[in-house]
């Protein structure tokens, strides 16, 4: 029997009865928050063999081993994970061993076994036999191995029953409990599973099987399960579902899950029955079960219940992430914020259409509206009083609307209104009239020529660069000396530069009025000699990297009531010279015959130019005499060379580490102080632990059902 779509057993241990007939849990299994210690010996679920997602155990009092509960749990598929983990055992106060002696495969994800004060038999399990990669496993804060004294079956009687493997240079017996060995299949089976009698299963089996070489006798399937058979792919007219079985179209059409209730139902795409079309695809019609590729970003319609969505913070903008069509009105009122321009672009940058009006008022944090980088249509189906569909009022630092050279914006209905935007040049507004098709709609008072742009240098002259010189990490540039009508109005120059892999940056990218700016800025004083052209040396740059650079003249912005002329350059793109690349990464060598070595590597992280070739050097080394000191045909334990790793087990530090013996005849000496790197690593570790614990609590503590 398949049970699903995830089973949450909490508070009352008798809820475990829900697992009675389950052979596969299609979803997760949570057993948690059972605070009263119970006797679990009468609960046993031998039918359960597979969990398709993850297993989470948290604060279950009185439970000492999982082996009695789930004696035949063989596979945890990890189709969906709990914070990257397929098996989480956290704060299980009484758990003495894991005991899942039939667990053979965790298909995806890692394990996290943490803060289980009584838990032993952790170092005796070879997780590499169960998981593909053990590097992400997190086993911390359990009973110290020295206090455990884990013994595998038969070791006391000197008749060891379990097989040995090497973990961290330790060649040892592998077991789950004092009387259960860790099962290993004969090497002849290769990657295949095996029966209890060590006969190899069918290649499509995963974990184990009841009969050899039979695709109907598998405990679990390597790929997919269909009509009692393990198959490498789903047969025609059936579709992959939840990563493990094949279902028909009708099943897929009828799925109504709590997770997908708001959607239009499951879809069939690329041979899979899934909750939504994948990224880059959209339903072929609103109620279709099939997906087609999107042209450009996939449309996502967002609607505001109250008709008008107020954007007054990053949090409110976050609600619009991914939206391409906004049904309603946008009221933007951003007075302050950190890194606001790029945050707004992140959450609102995909909006293409607003069906109502757009109103921007008191948004003193905004320098530009370029964060609405895909807005192309304001329909004006709803308008403000006075028939305005684009309304810009009192934005003290707004300097640019959009980059009109690269922007096509249409306002289908309604007028525009601009007032009290002291840094917004009227020429910018007039340009918007032309581009948006609203020219002629506005009456005289709609664009106030006195209080828009009153504190900006609006009639800009163009500064021209006169020379550029590059090296691997420097750029030297000079430009024409700017001469305003009154030379006293010119104060200095500011050079703006940043990395620009593509020639598509604008002056206002990532800029807001609260100090955030994606451009680096350098002030350049006027050369005292009037005939010398101003210039700058930009240093500390990356080799073979394209930079965008522009220069602005810093001028007095008000002379009585007249607007004065400012000056700035076009954006110049310039690339630094190439340099020596960093070292190639992950060099591996292996011998595939007596006269050949195969050497592999990855490209350097910093190529610092176009790589044209690699140089491989090698030299012969004298043979290691150590290899001849042992008779490898003897059945004795092969000697393992142990290298001191220089780390101290936190739990083993004595009361007074200063008297620690530092080896040889040196006598007592001080423990070395931690390096900055070690301190940083510990800090990150602690942070990571906190993040996981928060995630756990947020996920499992839910309001009590009615």
């Amino acid at each position: 029997e398949i049970c699903g779509p995830g089973i949450d057993i909490r508070n009352d241990y008798q809820q475990l009865k829900r697992l009675e007939n389950c052979t596969v849990i299609e979803g997760y299994l949570h057993i948690l928050l059972i605070s009263k210690a119970e006797d679990y010996r009468s609960y046993r679920f031998p039918k359960l063999t597979v969990i398709t997602e993850y297993l989470l155990l948290f604060r279950v009092a009185g439970l000492e081993s999982l082996g009695d509960l789930f004696p035949n749990l063989t596979v945890i598929r990890g189709w969906k994970l709990f914070y990257n983990y397929a098996l989480v055992i956290f704060e299980m106060t009484n758990l003495k061993d894991i005991g899942l002696y039939n667990l053979r495969n965790i298909t995806r994800g890692a394990i996290r076994i943490e803060k289980n004060a009584d838990l032993c038999y952790l170092s005796t399990v070879d997780w590499s036999l169960i998981l593909d990669a053990v590097s992400n496993n997190y086993i911390v804060g359990n009973k110290p191995p020295k206090e455990c004294g884990d013994l595998c079956p038969g070791t006391m009687e000197e008749k060891p029953m379990c097989e040995k493997t090497t973990i961290n240079n330790e060649y040892n017996y592998r077991c789950w409990t004092t009387n259960r060995c860790q099962k290993m299949c004969p090497s002849t089976c290769g990657k295949r599973a095996c029966t209890e009698n060590n006969e190899c299963c069918h290649p499509e089996c995963l974990g184990s099987c009841s009969a050899p070489d039979n695709d109907t006798a598998c405990v679990a399937c390597r790929h997919y399960y269909y009509a009692g058979v393990c198959v490498p792919a789903c047969p025609p007219n059936t579709y992959r579902f939840e990563g493990w079985r094949c279902v028909d179209r009708d099943f897929c059409a009828n799925i109504l899950s709590a997770e997908s209730s708001d959607s239009e139902g499951f879809v069939i795409h690329d041979g899979e029955c899934m909750q939504e079309c994948p990224s880059g695809f959209i339903r072929n019609g609103s109620q279709s079960m099939y997906c087609i590729p999107c042209e450009g970003p996939c449309p996502k319609v967002c609607e505001e219940e109250k008709k008008t969505k107020t954007i007054d913070s990053v949090t409110s903008a976050q609600m619009l992430q991914g939206c391409t069509i906004f049904k309603g009105n946008l009221l933007i009122n951003i007075r302050r914020g950190n890194n606001i321009a790029s945050e707004l672009e992140n959450f609102m940058g995909l909006i293409e259409v607003v069906t109502g009006y757009v109103k921007i008022r008191h948004s003193h944090a905004l320098v530009s509206l370029s964060f609405l980088k895909n807005l192309r249509l304001i329909l004006g189906e709803e308008q403000l009083e006075g028939n305005y569909s684009f309304y810009v009022l009192d934005n003290q630092n707004l300097q640019q609307l959009w980059d009109w050279d690269h922007r096509n914006l249409t306002i289908k209905a309604g007028k525009m209104y601009f007032a009290f935007n002291p840094k917004l040049c009227v020429s910018e507004i007039y340009r918007m009239e032309e581009v948006t098709g609203t020219k002629g709609r506005q009456s005289k008072g709609d664009i106030n020529t006195r209080n828009n742009g009153e504190r900006a240098s609006c009639e800009s002259d163009v500064l021209h660069f006169t020379s550029t010189t590059t090296s691997k990490n420097r750029i030297i540039i000079t430009w024409h000396r700017y001469r305003p009508p009154d030379y006293r109005d010119l104060i200095s120059f500011t050079v703006y530069y940043k990395e620009a892999p593509f020639k598509n940056v604008t002056e206002y990218d990532g800029q807001d009025a609260c100090g955030s700016n994606s451009w680096n800025m350098v002030d350049v004083d006027l050369p005292p000699n009037k005939d010398v052209e101003p210039g700058i040396l930009l240093h500390g740059l990356k080799p073979w990297t394209q930079y965008a650079v522009y220069v602005k003249a810093v001028t007095l912005t008000m002379v009585e009531n007249d607007h004065i002329r400012g000056a700035k350059s076009e954006i110049l793109y310039i690339r630094t010279n190439a340099s020596v690349p960093s070292i190639p990464l992950d060099v591996l060598s292996a011998s595939n015959s007596s006269s050949q070595l195969i050497v592999k590597w990855n490209p350097p992280s910093l190529p610092n130019g176009n790589l044209s070739y690699y140089i491989v050097r090698w030299q012969r080394q004298p043979q290691d005499g150590y290899l001849y000191r042992h008779n490898y045909c003897s059945k004795d334990k092969i000697p393992i060379r142990k290298y001191a790793d220089g780390t101290i087990d936190i739990e083993e530090v004595t009361e007074n580490p200063k008297t620690e013996v530092c080896g040889g005849e040196k006598g007592p000496c001080c423990a070395c102080p931690k390096t900055e790197a070690e301190k940083q690593a510990e800090k990150e570790e602690a942070e990571y632990r906190k993040v996981f614990e928060n995630f756990l609590h947020n996920s499992i503590f839910v309001p009590r059902p009615e």
């Epitope: 029997e1 398949i2 049970c3 699903g4 779509p5 995830g6 089973i7 949450d8 829900r18 007939n21 389950c22 979803g27 099943f251 059409a253 009828n254 799925i255 109504l256 899950s257 709590a258 997770e259 997908s260 209730s261 239009e264 139902g265 609103s286 109620q287 059902p705 009615e706």
Partner: antibody, heavy 117, light 112 residues
Framework: QVQLQESGPGLVKPSETLSLTCTVS?????????WNWIRQPPGKGLEWIGY???????NYKPSLKDRVTISRDTSKNQFSLKLSSVTAADTAVYYC??????????WGQGTLVTVSS | DIVMTQSPLSLPVTPGEPASISCRSS???????????LQWYLQKPGQSPQLLIY???NRLYGVPDRFSGSGSGTDFTLKISRVEAEDVGVYYC?????????FGQGTKVEIK
Amino acid sequence: QVQLQESGPGLVKPSETLSLTCTVSGYSITGGYHWNWIRQPPGKGLEWIGYISYDGTNNYKPSLKDRVTISRDTSKNQFSLKLSSVTAADTAVYYCARYGRVFFDYWGQGTLVTVSS
Amino acid sequence: DIVMTQSPLSLPVTPGEPASISCRSSQSIVHSNGNTYLQWYLQKPGQSPQLLIYKVSNRLYGVPDRFSGSGSGTDFTLKISRVEAEDVGVYYCFQGSHVPWTFGQGTKVEIK
């Protein structure tokens, strides 16, 4: 895989309350779907009574609304029907069934409830 | 409530011959999302109903292709191209487009 099993008294006296429980195995009733009660008087057609959804919301047939309550016990993975003030006209085979986005996909085998003094 | 009216109420058939059952709704059963949630169920003697057709014309996987559904708006039809002995039972149409959901009164198909 999913199984539904109706249980409850087979005989109810007129004016009393009919109580039935549907025990679901193989699927968590909070995980999705609408969990329905349908009845069929002897020799007659099927009549939809109402449902409780995965999220606890209800929908009832208007003509029965004043007398019917469908509730659930998530810890036991069960949902229940209570029909008050019963008369002989409420004698029927009562089915519980699961409805997804489009159709009823699993039914119980039905339980006969007779209203008689 | 939407009333679903089936005809005929009884349909004696000869094996191998075609059969047709009509189902009319008292108002349109097109859902606001554009779908028409009309299904046909067969209830064999002593059993729970089983689904044959959903969303007017989609035959359930495993249902013989002699069964087909058609119609739109308020008029729907279930056809059996060649009746077989195992097809006997009561056929119900059902609408799940508008609450309260409603069944037709049933059509009894029996072998002549």
